[in-house]
Interface confidence: medium
């Protein structure tokens, strides 16, 4: 599925995104634009053997388990393949479980990239939340 | 136990298109990726490319671009590969296995020939 | 691409003697390298996963060995049902890649 970007920012809030860990919703939403596209089935490959998953590219090697990625850690305890479900559920516990872990939203290279210190409210700009 | 069943041998014309098919039994279809190989006499095997059929998520090898379509039809836990104008150089035998990074399942083959 | 290249392309051996094949990849793999047995007409079958870990069911005589770029499968006391083509590949990146095999027959 490829959410708009208000009805992301409602489904995300409804998840207990908003102001998770200090993130407001505008970040999240940020991220999932710069990481995904808002496509809940994006999967990018990376060097290391590992692939990215989901709205919010979670990664295989740490948090996620597609049986092939060497080292797997599986912090979030689940498939790979329930990150590409349209229903956001299992993206956002596991996101929920990395931005708790030390480094916050820095987790996500697109977030730190491209919303890191921007306007992200603009995110939510016009939104019925 | 995991098997993966393949479609039987085909005999085509070169230009014509087939259809291969793996069916996964034994595990969660939709978990796992789906690899499929290519096998010619002389020339050892070559991966062809891979697709999650929860998503249908898909890469390809460079070289099948074009070549090979993958799909996979999830209530039937079947995967399908479609190879098109074909021609000689395609004849060969193709498998499908799971995608573990290794290949410990595979299907039995399917054995393709393009003659005229 | 990485390019696994597997030497020797043919060795001829009596039942009994011990064995090593090589492979070796065109750059660092880690261990991400993998050993299979095809005997004619049959899938390829998975013997050693993880350069080093023996698959389930494999018997003790097939053991692997290496890192980064050389890598070595070795077979103990050589049984006749071993002999066949053996193949390694890698899933460090993709696409993924098959050495182009070597065939192991009786002498």
């Known amino acids: 599925k490829v959410f708009g970007r208000c009805e992301l920012a409602a489904a995300m809030k409804r998840h207990g995104l908003d102001n998770y860990r200090g993130y407001s919703l505008g970040n999240w939403v940020c991220a999932a634009k710069f990481e995904s596209n808002f496509n809940t089935q994006a999967t990018n490959r990376n060097t290391d053997g590992s692939t990215d998953y989901g709205i919010l590219q979670i990664n295989s090697r740490w948090w996620c388990n597609d049986g092939r990625t060497p080292g797997s850690r599986n912090l979030c305890n689940i498939p790979c393949s329930a990150l590409l479900s349209s229903d956001i559920t299992a993206s956002v516990n596991c996101a929920k479980k990395i931005v708790s872990d030390g480094n916050g939203m820095n987790a996500w290279v697109a977030w730190r990239n491209r919303c890191k210190g921007t306007d992200v409210q603009a995110w939510i700009r016009g939104c019925r939340l | 136990q995991v098997q993966l069943q393949e479609s039987g041998a085909e005999v085509m014309k070169p230009g014509a298109s087939v259809k291969i098919s793996c069916k996964a039994t034994?595990?969660?279809?939709?978990?796992?990726?789906i690899e499929w190989v290519k096998q010619r006499p002389g020339h050892g095997l070559e991966w062809i490319g891979e697709?999650?059929?929860?998503?249908?998520?898909?890469y390809y090898n460079e070289k099948f671009k074009g070549k090979a379509t993958f799909t996979a039809d999830t209530s039937s836990n079947t995967a399908y590969m479609q190879l098109s104008s074909l021609t000689s150089e395609d004849s060969a035998v193709y498998y499908c296995?799971?995608?573990?990074?290794?290949?410990?399942?595979w299907g039995q083959g399917t054995t393709l020939t393009v003659s005229s | 691409d990485i390019e696994l290249t597997q030497s020797p392309a043919t060795l001829s051996v009596t039942p009994g003697d011990s064995v090593s094949l090589s492979c070796r990849a065109s750059?660092?793999?880690?261990?991400?390298l993998h050993w299979y047995q095809q005997k004619p007409h049959e899938s390829p079958r998975l013997l050693i996963k993880?350069?080093?870990q023996r698959a389930s069911g494999i018997p003790s005589r097939f053991s692997g060995s290496g890192s980064g770029t050389d890598f070595t499968l070795s077979i103990n006391s050589v049984e006749t049902e071993d002999f066949g083509m053996y193949f390694c590949?890698?899933?460090?990146?993709?696409?993924?890649?098959f050495g182009g095999g070597t065939k192991l027959e009786i002498k």
């Open positions: 034994g595990y969660t279809f939709t978990t796992y990726w």
């Open positions: 296995a799971r995608g573990d990074g290794w290949y410990c399942y």
């Open positions: 590949q890698q899933s460090n990146s993709w696409p993924r890649t």
């Open positions: 750059q660092s793999i880690s261990n991400n």
């Open positions: 697709i999650l059929p929860g998503s249908g998520s898909t």
């Open positions: 993880y350069a080093s």
